[in-house]
Interface confidence: low
């Protein structure tokens, strides 16, 4: 019995179905086929869970969180024992193993391993200003999304006819910050933060209004 090499790793957007491949060759009939799918969750590597089981011609549910979401892609028994997981959740991220036994065919590699990563687009980021908006001050524009896998990067743009930040601005796309030094009236305007990762983007807006000093009455 020989389980075929798997693609190694699969990525899927949260909520979308995933197919975890596992196929094998065997010299024996599939009368005594026994297939166990296990997962080692990324969130709890010390606690492997059973996903689904095929034994004695019957299918059995695995861990409760997979109930109603998991099944074999084809009619069993078969040499293709791939499974699907519907409505993928963040907690489904982990390393999946298919363990295949088909007596009397013993020997060879009977385990296939596939990694599953559930990706999450950035949630609507939160934009805010830190620091005084008085002319001549330094301000920091902050942007962060609560959700996003892989971790989003953040790009700030000034929404004027250049779509560029002022020359006095420095940007950290990992932290989502822009520091604008010595702000002037020209720094005023609408700024947009675009949070992006492999599967999506989301934006927020921020209105920076630089405050000019009030003229003093002399008298």
């Amino acid at each position: 019995l020989e389980v075929s090499e798997s693609p190694g790793s699969i990525q899927v957007a949260r909520g979308q179905p995933a197919v975890l491949p596992c196929t094998f060759t065997t010299s024996a009939a599939l009368i005594n086929l026994n297939v166990i799918w296990m997962v080692t969750p990324l969130s709890n590597a010390n606690q492997p869970e059973q996903v689904i089981l095929y034994q004695g011609g019957q299918m059995f549910d695995g861990a409760p969180r997979f109930h109603g979401r998991v099944g074999f892609t084809g009619t069993m028994p078969a040499t293709n024992v791939s499974i699907f997981i519907n409505n993928t959740q963040l907690s489904d991220t982990g390393t999946y193993q298919c363990l295949v036994n088909n007596l009397p065919d013993i020997g060879g590699r009977n385990i296939g391993v596939t990694g599953l990563t559930v990706l999450v687009p950035p949630s609507a980021p939160h934009c805010q200003i830190q620091g005084s908006q008085d002319i001549g001050s330094d301000v920091i524009l902050l942007c962060s999304s609560e959700e996003g896998i892989p971790r989003p990067t953040y790009l700030w743009e000034k929404l004027d006819n250049t779509l560029k930040l002022p020359p006095t601005a420095t940007q950290d796309q990992v932290q989502g910050t822009v520091t604008i030094r010595n702000i002037s009236a020209l720094s005023s305007g609408l700024y947009q933060c675009v949070a992006s990762n492999a599967i999506g983007t989301s934006t927020c807006l921020l209105d920076l209004q630089v405050i000019s000093p009030q003229p003093r009455n002399i008298g």
Epitope: L155, E157, L163, K164, V194, T201, T203
Partner: antibody, heavy 120, light 107 residues
């Protein structure tokens, strides 16, 4: 004056791809976002995404993620929208629209629309 | 995604009538709300941006109001050229979602 001129109507088979172009004139192409909006026959407007012609950065509606690609060629002031794995429900008029007041709206400068028909 | 809900979906009115169309957002969008008019076979035309600002060249009989989640487009005295479909659209976040449209027909 500002003009957006789109490519002509297309008929495609399910599973194929279509690439619609939008040639801009009368303004600085790299200074304004370009949005793409579609409208199925008898239906409402559906925003697909935008491209920043300056940086090439894009922002796609989640519904089209993985199927749509927006690009631009700044040397000829043209934006492109390519939609792949076409299905019958992609039959629609596709519009490009320039970002307007503070880039927040799709302003009065729209292309004339390109009808894409997906039929076997 | 922010869901924009327009009401009514259609209405019949006469020339000279005052017409009001409402648009509700599923979450607060501040004043980032735009109104468009579309006639058959034509591209949409911007009427109002930022909830209440009249686009240049648009007749003053069109006005917009509201902030947060509830918005209104008002046509103070309906003219023959105003029979069309009207859409609201939020520009607070992506995707830039539209309402389903309100068709204004001749009574």
């Amino acid at each position: 004056q500002v003009q957006l001129v789109q490519s002509g109507a297309e008929v495609k088979k399910p599973g194929a791809s279509v690439k619609v172009s939008c040639k801009a004139s009368g303004y600085t192409f790299t200074g304004y976002y370009m949005h793409w909006v579609r409208q199925a026959p008898g239906q409402g407007l559906e925003w697909m995404g935008w491209i920043n012609p300056n940086s090439g950065g894009t922002n796609y509606a989640q519904k089209f993620q993985g199927r749509v690609t927006m690009t631009r060629n700044t040397s000829i002031s043209t934006a492109y929208m390519e939609l792949s794995s076409l299905r019958s429900e992609d039959t629609a008029v596709y519009y490009c629209a320039r970002g307007g007041q503070q880039q927040l709206v799709l302003d009065d400068y729209w292309g004339q629309g390109t009808l894409v028909t997906v039929s076997s | 995604d922010i869901v924009m809900t327009q009401s009514p979906s259609s209405l019949s009115a006469s020339v000279g009538d005052r017409v009001t169309i409402t648009c509700r957002a599923s979450q607060s969008i501040s004043s980032y709300l735009n109104w468009y008019q579309q006639k058959p076979g034509k591209a949409p035309k911007l009427l109002i941006y930022a909830a209440s600002s009249l686009q240049s060249g648009v007749p003053s009989r069109f006005s917009g109001s509201g902030s947060g989640t509830d918005f209104t487009l008002t046509i103070s005295s309906l003219q023959p050229e105003d029979f069309a479909t009207y859409y609201c659209q939020q520009s607070y976040s992506t995707p830039r979602t539209f309402g389903q449209g309100t068709k204004v027909e001749i009574k």
